[in-house]
């Protein structure tokens, strides 16, 4: 058993049929010695008396808020949560496996630039009685500071019969140099509590590997005389690291109709303009990627050909 | 000695072309190592990230763009002498950088070159003949060093009398390649910045 936060404890259980469970001793936080009784949750049934209560925790029915009283007055609370281990593996029931970029990916993180700010998000089908707490650091043995905000519900989607909830959190490395060469990864730890179930999820990454620029901005078209060709120009996104001559981007320019299966014109360039063939009912799209370290492409910025 | 550098665009900052070739060569070599050594811990997640130049050179700090000198997190050990040497500057009057920057890059390359050559000698003794260093990568390191045109003492190639542990050597190769790729990215950024200055 260990303390998650003040008066909240996590009991780690091997989860299998007829498992013996864990013996837990609760101590009432009071100078009083006599006349103390214990109850669980909203029940008035007295579980025991005395300054300590020893319980055998085997299942979720044994978890919950234990309260010690004296003469009708509440003295203190201890909330017991369960963390299940099945076949030597901690349970991952609360969050959905996003399977990208690989199986068992529960947390996904992205950074728009090299400033040390990043966003992580996760998915769940659970809508109520759910809390998250996020901690982060650079490295684990001698951790350097990363400050994370509160996790918030950022999107709701309907997937078949189920509703899916996306939560996200923003974090900022306390002293980040955009030009630095990372040798220690960022560690992100998410504590998830659903009702009386506790789970924890972790992710480890270098900022350079989670870079995904914002789409290029200010796309403009200029038709070329006596030609079907169009000059398309754009600018670096405002959120990208500066100076741009040091943090350079490369671009993919594509002309395509509504359907992905339609024919297309595609060209790659390091410049902020390109010449392509425009077709009726097609769109010109441009996306960006770090020129020197190939992490993710940005989303497309698009304008209609006409 | 100023060696002429053949680049497609004659007005181009001479080292930019070489640094692009360097990044390409080390990226290709790393990809090849990952594929060939698929049963060894060779991915970014699996290896320890070591920097053989740590405490010996200061490339990131020395080559910091002017715009980032206002960022205190970037200034832990920054020197302030300006560039005065090295053929890559090709008579450009610029106060963005110090001699320290290009000489620091040169020293990085020299250290990696020695490590890679020592390692290659060991890998050539491996009866499995599983992986060797790409000669193109070694040639590209040499070309960029020549273009940088710094004179410095030659570092003797390390020789080891004991029987090489090929498993350890291959893991060390992965660690070196990952670190060198990251440094090659920095070098490319620096050259691109200089080219635009």
């Amino acid at each position: 058993i260990w303390e998650l936060k003040k008066d909240v404890y996590v009991v780690e259980l091997d989860w299998y049929p007829d498992a013996p469970g864990e013996m837990v001793v609760l101590t009432c936080d009071t100078p009083e010695e006599d006349g103390i009784t214990w109850t669980l949750d909203q029940s008035s049934e007295v579980l025991g008396s005395g300054k300590t209560l020893t319980i055998q925790v085997k299942e979720f029915g044994d978890a919950g808020q234990y309260t010690c009283h004296k003469g009708g007055e509440v003295l203190s609370h201890s909330l017991l949560l369960l963390h299940k281990k099945e076949d030597g593996i901690w349970s991952t029931d609360i969050l959905k496996d996003q399977k990208e970029p690989k199986n068992k990916t529960f947390l996904r993180c992205e950074a728009k630039n090299y400033s040390g700010r990043f966003t992580c998000w996760w998915l769940t089908t659970i809508s109520t009685d759910l809390t998250f707490s996020v901690k982060s650091s650079r490295g684990s043995s001698d951790p350097q500071g990363v400050t994370c905000g509160a996790a918030t519900l950022s999107a709701e989607r309907v997937r078949g019969d189920n509703k899916e909830y996306e939560y996200s959190v923003e974090c900022q490395e306390d002293s980040a140099c955009p030009a630095a060469e990372e040798s220690l990864p960022i560690e992100v730890m998410v504590d998830a509590v659903h009702k009386l179930k506790y789970e924890n999820y972790t992710s480890s990454f270098f900022i350079r590997d989670i870079i995904k620029p914002d789409p290029p901005k200010n796309l403009q078209l200029k038709p070329l005389k006596n030609s079907r060709q169009v000059e398309v120009s754009w600018e670096y996104p405002d959120t990208w690291s500066t100076p741009h001559s040091y943090f350079s981007l490369t671009f993919c320019v594509q002309v395509q109709g509504k359907s992905k299966r339609e024919k297309k014109d595609r060209v790659f360039t390091d410049k902020t303009s390109a010449t392509v063939i425009c077709r009726k009912n097609a769109s010109i799209s441009v996306r960006a990627q770090d020129r020197y370290y190939s992490s993710s492409w940005s989303e497309w910025a698009s304008v209609p050909c006409s | 000695r100023n060696l002429p550098v053949a680049t497609p665009d004659p007005g181009m900052f001479p080292c930019l072309h070489h640094s692009q070739n360097l990044l390409r060569a080390v990226s290709n070599m790393l990809q090849k190592a990952r594929q060939t050594l698929e049963f060894y811990p060779c991915t970014s997640e699996e290896i320890d990230h070591e920097d053989i130049t740590k405490d010996k050179t200061s490339t990131v700090e020395a080559c910091l763009p002017l715009e980032l000198t206002k960022n205190e997190s970037c200034l832990n050990s920054r020197e302030t002498s300006f560039i005065t040497n090295g053929s890559c500057l090709a008579s450009r009057k610029t106060s963005f950088m110090m001699a320290l920057c290009l000489s620091s890059i040169y020293e990085d390359l020299k250290m990696y070159q020695v490590e890679f050559k020592t390692m290659n000698a060991k890998l050539l003794m491996d009866p499995k003949r599983q992986i060797f260093l790409d000669q193109n990568m070694l040639a590209v390191i040499d070309e960029l060093m020549q273009a940088l045109n710094f004179n410095s003492e030659t570092v003797p190639q390390k020789s080891s009398l004991e029987e090489p542990d090929f498993y350890k050597t291959k893991i060390k190769l992965c660690i070196l390649l990952h670190a060198f790729r990251i440094r090659a990215v920095t070098i490319d950024r620096v050259m691109s910045y200089l080219n635009a200055s």
Partner: antibody
Framework: QVQLVQSGAEVKKPGSSVKVSCKAS????????LHWVRQAPGQGLEWMGW????????EYAPKFQGRVTITADESTSTAYMELSSLRSEDTAVYYC???????????WGQGTLVTVSS | DIVMTQSPLSLPVTPGEPASISCRAS??????LHWYQQKPGQAPRLLIY???QSISGVPSRFSGSGSGTDFTLTISSLQPEDFATYYC?????????FGQGTKVEIK
């Protein structure tokens, strides 16, 4: 299976014209760009131009501008390349090639040898 | 027009050995570079597109690399059926242009 089948070899006199055909099968004809590329005996490849069969849009290499005409007939899934004012240096194998991407070629015809000789 | 220069023009190789063909553009073309193989009396065949992207059905011993002005086609271990002429082609701008070809011959 996508296939491009070209018309047979031709022998032409200098100053005359030649029209080579390229019939496509497999896939929808208008879903692809169609190009013409030629190769003189023992020489390399030379791009001549492209057509979008969907709308008849064309683009020609400056070298051939004014001498080449590329057309397409959607009803028969056939593209044509006509080269006029032939000279001996136009002796070459003429290939049609197509792709959903405009700027490179993933399926080629078998080639048509055009010999220009007096 | 962008001029594509291949080297060497002729490459004698022993079967089973690796081979590398270089292609240089007269100006930067990012990764807008494609490789073709042509055997005598046959049409060219696409091997690699956008510098390094492999084509399904093309053996994995063929790989491409490069960006900007310098590109390489590598055949890791030459098989008897690989002896042919190889062309690079740029698609950065019209007119599309090819290298002059590299003939890979049996040593």
């Amino acid at each position: 299976q996508v296939q491009l089948v070209q018309s047979g070899a031709e022998v032409k006199k200098p100053g005359s014209s030649v029209k080579v055909s390229c019939k496509a099968s497999g896939g929808t004809f208008s879903d692809y760009y169609l190009h013409w590329v030629r190769q003189a005996p023992g020489q390399g490849l030379e791009w001549m131009g492209w057509i979008d069969p969907e709308n008849g849009d064309t683009e020609y290499a400056p070298k051939f501008q004014g001498r080449v005409t590329i057309t397409a007939d959607e009803s028969t899934s056939t593209a044509y390349m006509e080269l006029s004012s032939l000279r001996s240096e136009d002796t070459a194998v003429y290939y049609c090639a197509r792709n959903k991407e405009l700027r490179y070629f993933d399926v080629w015809g078998q080639g048509t040898l055009v010999t220009v000789s007096s | 027009d962008i001029v594509m220069t291949q080297s060497p023009l002729s490459l004698p190789v022993t079967p089973g050995e690796p081979a590398s063909i270089s292609c240089r553009a007269s100006q930067s073309i990012s990764i807008n570079l494609h490789w073709y193989q042509q055997k005598p009396g046959q049409a060219p065949r696409l091997l690699i597109y956008f510098a390094s992207q492999s084509i399904s059905g093309v053996p994995s011993r063929f790989s491409g690399s490069g960006s900007g002005t310098d590109f390489t086609l590598t055949i890791s271990s030459l098989q008897p059926e690989d002896f042919a002429t190889y062309y690079c082609q740029q698609s950065n701008s019209f007119p599309l242009t090819f290298g002059q070809g590299t003939k890979v011959e049996i040593k």
